[in-house]
């Protein structure tokens, strides 16, 4: 089976690497524009230069291309706690990240929110906080893990998953209650 190619890929595959087919004349291969530039005019003929212009401020192209417009620079999302790691240049998009002691949680492929790394109070750090993953905590005896925080077993309701982890404490509480009812 031959993989389906889009029109642009079909057109590009006829020309050697770094060139593309002239949209009006498929016997001409034009040189692609360098990163940081965009296509202003196709080359007039074989062996003649493509007219490429530099991207304007606030836009970029990160690879060789024959785009009619540069791409708009991304903005870091303040409401998601993002900070700018590096500014947009003509050949590279803005790089956004999180502050120190924070990690990225991806809600979707291209949307992340910054959250504080868990400190593992009433527990120990099992795995340190990473760029894209929160600290993994192990809780001390008498505590159970809920939403990556160590919570006292006194907050464990019998119906919750914590009952297995807090079983000795729950039994003790039950035993104390029983002894008081004789």
């Amino acid at each position: 089976l031959v993989p389906h190619l889009g029109d642009r890929e079909k057109r590009d595959s006829v020309c050697p690497q770094g060139k593309y087919i002239h949209p009006q004349n498929n016997s001409i291969c034009c040189t692609k524009c360098h990163k940081g530039t965009y296509l202003y005019n196709d080359c007039p003929g074989p062996g003649q230069d493509t007219d490429c212009r530099e991207c304007e401020s606030g836009s970029f192209t990160a690879s060789e291309n024959h785009l009619r417009h540069c791409l708009s620079c991304s903005k870091c999302r303040k409401e998601m706690g993002q900070v700018e790691i590096s500014s947009c240049t003509v050949d590279r998009d803005t790089v956004c990240g999180c502050r120190k002691n924070q990690y990225r949680h991806y809600w979707s492929e291209n949307l992340f929110q910054c959250f504080n790394c868990s400190l593992c109070l009433n527990g120990t750090v099992h795995l340190s906080c990473q760029e894209k993953q929160n600290t993994v905590c192990t809780c001390h005896a008498g505590f159970f893990l809920r939403e990556n925080e160590c919570v006292s077993c006194s907050n464990c309701k019998k119906s919750l998953e914590c009952t297995k982890l807090c079983l000795p404490q729950i039994e003790n509480v039950k035993g104390t209650e029983d002894s008081g009812t004789t």
Epitope: E79, Q113, F115
Partner: nanobody, 119 residues
Framework: EVQLLESGGGLVQPGGSLRLSCAAS????????MVWVRQAPGKGLEWVSH????????YYADSVKGRFTISRDNSKNTLYLQMNSLRAEDTAVYYC????????????WGQGTLVTVSS
């Protein structure tokens, strides 16, 4: 007590429009960025759109970009989602929520409103 009440869902034909509303109470609405998420039958939660406190910065998932518009009226404590050019794949229960702060979970959200796109 935080309450979020979605409305405006219903049955609509492909290409049609709907406007969802979310009435908020029990917190200072104007201080909170707000989110629309949806859950299609048998699928997980999908982030649809969010809006900052003042309604200036917005975000849209690629699947709805150019078709949906999020807005808010802080004087009415209400969040909106204008949905145009609806497609069958937009069929889902739509929920509004406060943007999470402490961790990646929704502490408060409504009961949802069902949007069905079908001919």
């Amino acid at each position: 007590e935080v309450q979020l009440l979605e409305s405006g869902g219903g049955l609509v034909q492909p290409g049609g429009s709907l406007r969802l509303s979310c009435a908020a109470s029990g917190f200072t609405f104007a201080h909170e960025p707000m989110v629309w998420v949806r859950q299609a039958p048998g699928k997980g939660l999908e982030w649809v759109s969010h809006i900052d406190r003042v309604g200036q910065d917005t975000y849209y998932a690629d699947s709805v970009k150019g078709r949906f518009t999020i807005s808010r009226d802080n004087s009415k404590n209400t969040l909106y989602l204008q949905m145009n050019s609806l497609r069958a794949e937009d069929t889902a229960v739509y929920y509004c929520a406060k943007l999470p702060k402490r961790g990646p979970r929704f502490d408060y959200w409504g009961q949802g409103t069902l949007v069905t796109v079908s001919s």
